[in-house]
């Protein structure tokens, strides 16, 4: 969690002199409670906005907006504490609006906003606006909180932000997977414009289960510049296991900006449709089936063969 690095942070508006300060998230009024405290914020709204840094990088930011209630407690309002909590890491960042003049009632409802908290793709935040001073321990709460889920890098506007581009969001491999005869899969995808290697991860599952029955990893060497944006075709040989028919193909790039943490793309091949009419049962059923040669599922030593070529 951090603040966007550019421009002086402003909270002043006509009729109010105000300054934005860093905050420890522990306002002095918690330690030294006051008798008279303002009411809570009204209509807290959080939206996804985008902002450029001085260096020209584009980041997603939380745009926080709220209004004041139209009661006499605004006479005791000395400012606001804005707090953003990242749910998964419990990291919290706060800023304080410090009012340098007293608020007066005027015709329009007072409205405040702040758009400088940089947020991460796919993360969830709790945004709280606390009016200051904070209430005495048994007083009515004078804060409002809302959750804010940031879209991940698949989202159209997010794709072009610096953090998403760094993880390879602009690459669209347009994966196609087709089943061939003799237990083979043909995987085709578009290479990106970087001389970096790729990995194809094949995981196969039984029809209705989530436990894999076959795994295979295939390495694709870095393409030459003339192969950028071309299709790469790979044929993967599957393990001949009856019922191991649902295949997930995942392509992992290793771009220089994200290394082994780049966005992956995947495609799935479903099991073939089961016939409506059941197969006839023979008159004679054996009491046991002949033992098959192998019962291990995992592909530890690259038993699945494969070959590939780049297609121009």
């Amino acid at each position: 969690l951090r603040l966007l690095d550019h421009r002086a942070l402003v909270c002043s508006q006509p009729g109010l002199n105000c300054t934005v300060k860093n905050s420890t998230c522990l306002d002095d009024s918690w330690i030294h409670p006051r008798n008279l405290t303002p009411s809570s914020p009204k209509d807290l709204q959080i939206q996804l906005h985008f902002a450029h840094t001085q260096q020209g990088d584009l980041f997603p930011v939380a745009h926080i907006e709220w209004t004041l209630q139209t009661d006499a407690s605004i006479l005791y309002l000395e400012g606001a504490e804005l707090s953003v909590l990242q749910l998964n890491t419990n990291e919290r960042l706060c800023v304080k609006f410090q009012f340098l003049s007293m608020l007066q009632h005027h015709r329009k409802r007072w409205r405040f906003s702040f758009s400088h908290f940089v947020v991460d793709p796919g993360q969830e935040y709790e945004v709280t606006v606390h009016h200051l001073p904070k209430p005495i321990p048994d007083g009515d709460p004078n804060h409002q909180s809302k959750n804010f889920l940031v879209p991940d890098c698949e989202h159209a506007r997010m794709k072009v932000t610096t953090p998403c581009m760094s993880s390879g969001s602009l690459w669209d491999p347009n994966i196609t997977v087709e089943t061939l005869e003799a237990h083979q899969l043909r995987v085709s995808f578009t290479l990106w414009n970087e001389s970096t290697h790729y990995q194809i991860l094949l995981t196969s599952f039984p029809h209705m289960e989530n436990h894999s029955c076959f795994e295979h990893m295939h390495h694709i060497p870095a393409p030459r510049p003339e192969e950028f944006h071309q299709r790469s075709n790979v044929t993967l040989t599957l393990r001949n296991l009856k019922g191991c028919c649902r295949h997930q193909v995942q392509i992992q790039p290793f771009f220089s900006s994200c290394l082994n943490d780049c966005l992956r793309h995947s495609a799935t091949v479903s099991c073939p449709e089961m016939p409506d009419t059941p197969e006839p049962i023979p008159d004679y059923m054996p009491l046991w089936e002949p033992r098959s040669g192998s019962s291990d599922y995992k592909d530890d030593d690259d038993k699945g063969s494969s070959h590939h070529h780049h297609h121009h």
């Epitope: 998230c25 522990l26 909590l85 749910l87 998964n88 890491t89 419990n90 990291e91 919290r92 796919g122 993360q123 969830e124 709790e126 709280t128 804060h143 909180s145 809302k146 959750n147 943490d261 780049c262 966005l263 992956r264």
Partner: antibody, heavy 118, light 107 residues
Framework: EVQLVESGGGSVQPGGSLRLSCAAS????????MNWVRQAPGKGLEWVSI????????HYADSVKGRFTISRDNAKNSLYLQMNSLRDEDTAVYYC???????????WGQGTTVTVSS | DIQMTQSPSSLSASVGDRVTITCRAS??????LAWYQQKPGKFPELLIY???TLQSGVPSRFSGSGSGTDFTLTISSLQPEDVATYYC?????????FGPGTKVDIK
């Protein structure tokens, strides 16, 4: 000393209800999200639920969704788990756990045992 | 939802051995991964967070590495007090799923 103490466990029949509590001390409870994690006898850890510091974000594991309700009272430094429509598979030791700033859970209670059996 | 797998499910090693446990996420989780140690009859203890950051008070023989989908917990020199079950947990976003665990004991 930072401490979490769970209570409210016990034996209950399938379909019954229990309310677990977790009393926090030694830290600013209202600044932290809080979790419930459980562990069935002889099994691994299973994350159950999380509630954010101001209760505006709540998530549950699929296995308890619609049956369990997490809540908190910051004024009382307490975390709760209301468990309804209990099943045999809910039998476990239930831990409350505080997340560490940066990730993971660094403070755990000793756990309270819930037994669901007819 | 993202699945977490751990291997091996159990291992036996001698005192002083280097022990490696792997954890794999079915989709990328960046470095949002924690490792825990749980001794029999005790609550879990955080060893490593952010995939590779050692929790304060944890012996330096423990280390973590990895990013994306593949992660490793290494005990550089196994000690008798390290007999426990080790769990990984992803926390990129809810649900914050644990791996099935790896039981470590002494030969």
């Amino acid at each position: 000393e930072v401490q979490l103490v769970e209570s409210g466990g016990g034996s209950v029949q399938p379909g019954g209800s229990l309310r677990l509590s977790c009393a926090a001390s030694g830290f600013t409870f209202s600044s932290y999200s809080m979790n419930w994690v459980r562990q069935a006898p002889g099994k691994g850890l299973e994350w159950v639920s999380i509630i954010s510091s101001r209760s505006s974000i709540i998530h549950y594991a699929d296995s308890v969704k619609g049956r369990f309700t997490i809540s908190r009272d910051n004024a009382k430094n307490s975390l709760y788990l209301q468990m309804n429509s209990l099943r045999d598979e809910d039998t476990a030791v239930y831990y409350c756990a505080r997340p560490k700033v940066g990730g993971g859970m660094d403070v755990w209670g000793q756990g309270t045992t819930v037994t669901v059996s007819s | 939802d993202i699945q977490m797998t751990q291997s091996p499910s159990s291992l036996s090693a001698s005192v002083g051995d280097r022990v490696t446990i792997t954890c794999r996420a079915s989709q990328g989780i960046s470095n949002y991964l924690a490792w825990y140690q749980q001794k029999p009859g005790k609550f879990p203890e955080l060893l490593i967070y952010a995939a590779s950051t050692l929790q304060s008070g944890v012996p330096s023989r423990f280390s973590g590495s990895g990013s994306g989908t593949d992660f490793t917990l290494t005990i550089s020199s196994l000690q008798p007090e390290d007999v426990a079950t080790y769990y990984c947990q992803k926390y990129n976003r809810a649900p914050f799923t644990f791996g099935p665990g790896t039981k470590v004991d002494i030969k």
